[in-house]
């Protein structure tokens, strides 16, 4: 039930008033406005957009809107020395070169400053050598190559298909395998859905389309030169050799027309099985090197990009809370795009803009939220979540004391099939209750709730009659708030049918073809899915900022903790002999989870019964709820990942996009059978169980009666 008792205003100013004010037509108009030119981080165009948003948010009625700037390391191609890949013959002559740019989409032929496809933060270099096809370049793909197929990637240039995991993990894996260069390409198997035309006639990737993206392995550090601290005017910057997360080998992305030319000549081994074959008409041989007549030909990369310290601008808007102004609910999404940003990020930014307008309208009518709402338009997300991370580093002391929740607002759509939510377990009940009150936009669900269509199309694998809600991973601006600071976080967007569409992300992701027309013609002509996402994101913010008792249910954390403990125990039990030999026990963890469950249950009972008219007790109970997420933070961080401090969740070490539960234990157990010192390895498992058990117990105790 929505709570609007927080402020002494007329009853019409409730959740319904806020939601009714949100209009699809406005979101459409804002999206058009935000996508007419590129808004690459660090460019004048993106600075101008920041100022425009600042001005409009002020007009909408926010109390204050400020620009927060930082000078961070970014990466750009050399305008006069383009990046490309060639096939060279034995005399060193270039007999094939990859394209230098994507053919522009209709209507955009005369747009300037379209950055050509590149892998941001690639070092310069011109390596040449034999090619090895490494599938998706996942950890398991390199295991297959090295351990099973006995193929050595050392000194080779590897070609990997995009998809399945974050591209930075691919590059890291290739580096560890000894590769001297990486070519990334989009295979039609992953980026061309059957039965759909390629852009501009449909939403599929054309052969000349290329996915841009950064290839960092920051592990939450933010600006590579100022880890842990804001990149402000007096910052001390590391030398480039000490920068965090930079790749050490040249990397470049290509489309599938160019990939075909490289892959069709591949020799060496056949692919090990069907999971290594894409949809091109090539054998998908692994190599190394080319076949037969082409065996003397090599691949050469020409990479001339530069890393530059560049100014970026966040826009931070404030709507002051009437009752608890020192409690912050944050709605943030990024503004910078690789090119036009038709989906990423502007489908999200347009929704944030409309949410701000709706809140502003209520405020002009005399309403205020109970708690302060902060709105953020982040810069340089595409370059490693830099804007959000630098701002959070600068404001960490405030955030850790005052941060109630963070709701992320990147792309509103990656499909138009059903809702997708990733969030802390504390928000499960909030999301369930909210979506039960919202109308479904889906065909065939007229008059039904969003909860109903979502549950039908994306059922929970564990609980019948409930929708799937996923773990938070990373790859977006919630990372610093959740993984580093322990602020309860969530994200929502409309997604594809994962059952029938096996491609990774959406086909035109980070390409020049991600335009306004892509969205308006093919994904959401009526902008009804955008409106639904605005209602979900905005509704979550409204409830978090306005409900008298914070809409967090700690019992849901208890449920998942048990599930995660069971899961990690079953992984460990694949090694029963070693567990016995090294006396590995999970008793402490299961005991802590049991205690957490009991204490959470008692806390929830007290939450029903306490006197909500007593502001001190109310604040005390709310603080226990607010600080519960914080209690899962280990100040020492995870091994070798000091900025991933959440003990229950972290981005997977093998895929930044995915969340892993009990990551410390998981990583200690991963590939443990191959460790040279089993005693040491199992010792680390035991240490991580200890850390996890202690953290869960400590978190439980924050929910106990205070005296």
């Amino acid at each position: 039930k929505s709570s609007n008792e927080a402020t002494n205003i007329t009853p019409k100013h409730n959740m319904k008033a806020f939601l009714d004010e949100l209009k699809a037509e406005n979101i459409k108009k804002f999206l058009y406005n935000f996508t007419q030119i590129p808004h690459l981080a660090g460019t004048e165009q993106n600075f101008q957009l920041a100022k425009q948003i600042q001005s409009q948010w002020k007009e909408f009625g926010l109390d204050s809107v400020e620009l927060a700037h930082y000078d961070v390391l970014l990466s750009y191609p050399n305008k006069t020395h383009p990046n490309y890949i060639s096939i060279i013959n034995e005399d060193g002559n270039e007999i094939f070169n990859t394209s230098l740019f994507e053919p522009p989409p209709p209507g955009y032929e005369n747009v300037s400053d379209i950055v050509p496809p590149f892998s941001a933060f690639s070092p310069q270099g011109m390596p040449e050598g034999d090619l090895v096809y490494v599938n998706y370049a996942r950890t398991e793909d390199f295991f297959k190559l090295e351990r099973d197929m006995k193929i050595n990637c050392s000194g080779k240039i590897v070609i990997a298909r995009y998809g399945k995991v974050f591209r930075g993990n691919k590059v890291k894996n290739a580096q560890l395998a000894g590769a001297k260069g990486v070519i990334l390409y989009s295979d039609p198997a992953d980026y061309f859905a059957p039965g759909v035309k390629s852009y501009p006639d449909g939403w599929n990737l054309p052969g000349g389309g290329v996915q841009r993206g950064n290839i960092l392995n920051l592990n939450g550090a933010g600006d590579p030169l100022t880890p842990g601290y804001p990149a402000n005017e007096y910052a001390y910057r590391r030398g480039i050799a000490e920068a965090v997360g930079l790749p050490s080998i040249p990397v470049h992305p290509i489309g599938y027309y160019d990939a075909q030319k490289l892959l069709e000549k591949m020799g060496g081994s056949a692919p090990p099985d069907s999971s290594w074959r894409g949809s091109l008409k090539v054998p998908y041989n692994v190599g190394p090197g080319f076949t037969g007549n082409f065996s003397t030909q090599k691949v050469k990369m020409h990479i001339h990009s530069t890393n530059e310290v560049t100014r970026i601008y966040n826009v931070i808007g404030t709507l002051r809370g009437a009752v608890e102004p020192d409690r912050y609910v944050i709605l943030g999404g990024h503004r910078d795009s690789w090119v036009f940003g038709g989906i990423d990020p502007q489908s999200g930014a347009a929704v944030v803009h409309e949410i701000v307008r709706s809140f502003g309208t209520l405020k002009k009518e005399g309403w205020r939220p109970r708690r302060t709402i902060l709105f953020a338009s982040w810069d340089a997300e595409e370059f490693g979540l830099l804007g959000s991370t630098e701002w959070a580093e600068e404001n960490s002391r405030l955030l850790q004391e005052r941060g109630v929740a963070y709701i992320n607002a990147d792309s509103s759509i990656e499909g138009n099939y059903t809702l997708r939510v990733d969030c802390t377990p504390l928000m499960y009940s909030l999301v369930h209750n909210l979506t039960k009150e919202l109308k479904s936009p889906d065909e065939g669900f007229e008059g039904k709730s969003l909860y109903e269509s979502w549950t039908k199309k994306s059922p929970s694998p564990e609980f019948s009659g409930m929708p799937r809600i996923s773990k938070l991973g990373s790859g977006n601006d919630f990372e610093v708030f959740f993984q580093r600071l322990g602020i309860a976080s969530g994200r929502a967007r409309y997604t594809k049918n994962w059952e029938t569409n096996k491609f990774s992300g959406y086909p035109l992701y980070h390409s020049v073809y991600e335009t306004y027309e892509l969205v308006e013609k093919f994904y959401d002509p009526m902008f009804k899915y955008h409106l639904t996402v605005a209602q979900v994101r905005g509704g979550m913010v409204f409830e978090l900022a306005n409900s008298i008792v914070l809409p967090f249910d700690c019992r849901d954390y208890a449920v998942v903790l048990r599930k995660y403990a069971d899961k990690i125990y079953s992984i460990s039990m694949k090694h029963p002999q070693e567990m016995k030999t090294y006396s590995v026990s999970f008793d402490s963890l299961f005991s802590a989870v049991k205690n957490f469950t009991e204490i959470a249950s008692k806390f929830s009972e007290r939450l029903q019964d306490f006197d909500k008219s007593n502001p001190i007790v109310l604040r005390m109970m709310n603080d226990q709820l607010m600080f519960l997420e914080r209690a899962f933070i280990d100040p020492l961080g995870l091994p070798d990942r000091p900025f991933y401090r959440h003990v229950i969740y972290a981005p997977s070490s093998h895929n930044k996009y995915a969340g892993e539960s009990f990551p410390g234990i998981y990583d200690a157990l991963f590939d443990i059978e191959s460790k040279v010192d089993p005693s040491k390895a199992w010792g680390e498992v035991k240490r991580q169980i200890y850390v996890a058990a202690f953290t869960v117990q400590a978190a439980a105790e924050t929910l106990s009666e205070v005296a």
């Epitope: 398991e140 351990r147 099973d148 069907s274 999971s275 007549n293």
Partner: antibody, heavy 115, light 107 residues
Framework: EVQLVQSGAEVKKPGASVKVSCKTS????????IHWVRQAPGQSLEWMGN????????TYNQKFQGRVTITVDKSTSTAYMELSSLRSEDTAVYYC????????WGQGTLVTVSS | DIVMTQSPDSLAVSLGERATLSCRAS??????VDWYQQKPDQSPKLLIY???TRHTGVPDRFTGSGSGTDFTLTISSLQAEDVAVYFC?????????FGAGTKVEIK
Amino acid sequence: EVQLVQSGAEVKKPGASVKVSCKTSGYTFTEYTIHWVRQAPGQSLEWMGNINPNNGGTTYNQKFQGRVTITVDKSTSTAYMELSSLRSEDTAVYYCAAGWNFDYWGQGTLVTVSS
Amino acid sequence: DIVMTQSPDSLAVSLGERATLSCRASQDVGTAVDWYQQKPDQSPKLLIYWASTRHTGVPDRFTGSGSGTDFTLTISSLQAEDVAVYFCQQKNSYPLTFGAGTKVEIK
């Protein structure tokens, strides 16, 4: 020590199916390709197909025209090969082998197809 | 399908002498060739992979060489326990194919 232990000999009638198992131990099951190879009496080796135990990805020899199905059970580190619509010329010793390079072989399973 | 042709069909060599086995692929397979040894009433065993790399535990009297279409397995000093049938196999393209085998005996 890597071991592949196959199920026992089978006698089948033409038109029937046979399912041969291959229980592995001594290595991480998901790491190595499993191939199936057969050898008719006095003949050479004939590759039938393979599977990636990690994700179930398979490749089959088209000669077997959809008659062969290779599966795995990760929980027991066991691979299976099922051959349907048996004919007399399918009489052979059937081997499983672990590793892309056929690093380790099972002891073989004799399948006799006879009316 | 790539055809692997082995020669000779059989080979008799005195103990301590060199045995040279040949394998020819019907098309270029790079170095994607392996060699196996099968003793009577036993399963095959991997000897050489990637044309020239000895498998773990294989004595160094076994040497593989070649690339493209022509491959050789050499037993530098034949021992009694080397009596077996030797198969080459290509893994360059599907279906993976084996040669008919060369039978090595003691002269």
